[in-house]
């Protein structure tokens, strides 16, 4: 390209500038223990620090630790990047109920709506389920298609957050009540899933390619490395990504050399209690003797709030111990008891949450 | 298993440099960062600075910038830490150390240290 | 730089007995906190990361806990060979940085 040899030529006339043939352009070149931010950096502040794995660099040019989602109720919503931390939130079926910086210091399961009542918004990782009256003439348990779906792809009913989150303006929010019994004898009958692979005992990123290689001649790539298992924050600093070393969880998005790893409770489990980009508990998905269903949407995203039901209505059902502690066990199919009479089983299987009916369905 | 083995002990003049070396053994020597802690007789322990052996990448502690210069031969597994202009306040154990990747944010494997002696 | 303190250069147990070992941030570290084991004459060990995550092979008499800026280290049941200096360290930001120590004296 003989148009570009000028281009070509100031660059080399320059020793803080390199000709990148592969953008067509004079590129700053990173001082030496720098990296760069792009491919082809044009100012020195498109120079940055590298951390170790799992650290990101923040603002004040230091490695800092990115927030590990290993808790069992976290999962990871954004990975270790190198200028910003991984980022934790509840995990499907959960909700926030006190935040933490990236991260939630305490998860609670979505709320089931109470006999009477039906899903007006699905609990989110941040919201519990809110819900509203059944239509009129609908009885209790469901016996109008129209106004009572049971959802294709579903949702697993959910054990009442201890607390209630506030209710919004249109709702009410009320604690479901009712016996533990049937939680506890559906939890004893988890078992435990053999542990699935996760980032324990392996470098989450190869510490030899591009992004930690120094700047060789002719190159961009100035950036400040960081070591493995560590991102660079946005100042700079190397910042420890989460670990997922724990048994009840598995890895949702790798550590980068910019963001930090986020961790997620395995199949089968739910977060109960967040951390940044992580969950700091994992519990079993609780099964209750629900006469509600729930539409179908992403329980991670929404959450459970109550309206008050019909007149003489009672909630009848608490999927979890008071305490809110459950055994942390998973496992790939589960048999898990249905109906207070215990008279029905109902294998489960943790791909995909579903809902189920007083029948059983 | 992983090991750090660690050169013998220094004996220097004010003034002078020593170079000490940390020979990595049970994994693979470019795929942890190597880190190098001072600690002073009945002291606290000092984070010195890293090394990536994969690409010589160093990072150090500002306190250590001028004072200790970390390299690393990969065809001998062997991370090496240079001290300069020594004084009386160089005195001291220094260790290399390493992560475990994916299982450990601590130092999990430490050298045995090696002692270095200022004196005139 | 972060500064960690432990405010106890000292304490005495007895065996059997239950010891916490405490340690301070002068910032929020996020949970991002080992504890080391060293005993006279050897390199330190590493017993707990992320404030409450056992090292493989550490026994489970110690445990981790703490957040924000708290921590502590705490031996349900002290043996003999636990005579030591524990250190804290912050592993959340460069310069990582360590506690001045904690020697646990047995009666």
């Known amino acids: 390209f003989p148009q570009d040899r000028p281009f070509e030529d100031t660059c080399h006339g320059n020793p803080s500038h390199y000709y990148d043939k592969a953008v067509r352009r004079c590129c700053y070149r990173c001082p030496m223990g720098l990296f760069p931010t792009q491919q082809c950096p044009q100012r020195p502040t498109d120079c940055r620090k590298q951390c170790e794995p799992d650290y990101y660099l923040d603002e004040a040019d230091r490695c800092t630790a990115c927030v590990t989602c290993s808790r069992d109720d976290l999962v990871e919503k954004t990975p270790c990047a190198w200028n910003s931390s991984r980022v934790c939130e509840c995990r499907p079926g959960m909700f926030c109920s006190t935040s933490a910086v990236n991260s939630c210091a305490r998860c609670f399961f979505h709320s089931v709506c109470p006999a009477g009542m039906i899903v007006k918004f699905p609990g989110t990782a941040q919201k519990n389920t809110v819900c509203e009256p059944a239509s009129p003439g609908v009885s209790p348990a469901c016996a109008s298609p129209e106004n009572c779906k049971e959802p294709s792809s579903g949702t697993i009913p959910q054990a009442k957050p201890t607390p209630v989150s506030p209710a919004t303006s249109s709702a009410s929010t009320m604690p479901v009540r009712g016996g533990t019994r049937l939680a506890q004898e559906a939890a004893s009958k988890l078992t435990r899933a053999p542990d699935s692979p996760s980032s324990v005992g392996r470098p989450s990123s190869d510490p030899g390619l591009s992004p930690t290689q120094p700047c060789p001649e002719g190159s961009g790539d100035c950036r400040k490395q960081c070591e493995p298992d560590y991102y660079l924050d946005e100042a700079g600093r190397c910042t420890a990504c989460v670990s997922c070393s724990r048994d009840d969880l598995v890895e949702k998005t790798p550590c980068a050399w910019n963001s930090s790893r986020t961790c997620e409770c395995r199949p089968g489990m739910i977060c109960a209690t967040s951390a940044t980009n992580s969950c700091a508990r994992c519990v079993p998905y609780p099964i209750c003797a629900a006469e509600t269903v729930t539409k179908p949407q992403d329980m991670a995203e929404k959450d459970t709030t109550f309206e008050a039901p019909p007149l003489g209505t009672q909630p009848d059902c608490n999927p979890t111990p008071e305490n809110g502690e459950a055994p942390a066990s998973t496992s790939p199919t589960q048999s898990l008891l249905v109906d207070s009479q215990a008279s029905k089983t109902l294998p489960i299987p943790t791909s995909a949450p579903v809902a189920l009916s007083s029948t059983g369905k | 298993q992983v090991q750090l083995q660690q050169s013998g002990a220094e004996l220097a003049k004010p003034g002078a440099s020593v170079k000490m070396s940390c020979k990595a053994s049970?994994?693979?020597?470019?795929?942890?960062?190597m880190h190098w802690v001072k600690q002073r007789p009945g002291q606290d322990l000092e984070w010195i600075g890293y090394?990536?052996?994969?690409?010589?990448?160093?990072d150090y502690n500002q306190k250590f910038k001028d004072k200790a210069t970390l390299t690393a031969d990969k065809s001998s597994s062997t991370a090496y830490m240079q001290l300069s202009s020594l004084t009386s306040e160089d005195s001291a154990v220094y260790y290399c150390?390493?992560?475990?990747?994916?299982?450990?944010?601590?130092?999990?494997?430490w050298g045995q240290g090696t002692l270095v002696t200022v004196s005139a | 730089d972060i500064v960690m303190t432990q405010s106890h250069k000292f304490m005495s147990t007895s065996v059997g007995d239950r010891v916490s070992i405490t340690c301070k941030a002068s910032?929020?570290?996020?949970?991002?906190v080992a504890w080391y084991q060293q005993k006279p004459g050897q390199s330190p060990k590493l017993l707990i990361y992320?404030?409450?995550t056992r090292h493989t092979g550490v026994p489970d008499r110690f445990t981790g806990s703490g957040s924000g800026t708290d921590y502590s280290l705490t031996i349900s049941s002290v043996q003999a060979e636990d005579l030591a200096v524990y250190y804290c360290?912050?592993?959340?930001?460069?310069?990582?940085?360590f506690g001045s120590g904690t020697k646990l004296e047995i009666k």
């Open positions: 090394i990536n052996p994969s690409t010589d990448y160093t």
């Open positions: 150390a390493t992560r475990h990747y994916g299982s450990s944010y601590g130092f999990a494997y």
């Open positions: 360290q912050q592993h959340y930001r460069t310069p990582f940085t």
């Open positions: 049970g994994y693979t020597f470019t795929s942890y960062w």
């Open positions: 992320w404030a409450s």
């Open positions: 910032q929020d570290v996020s949970t991002a």
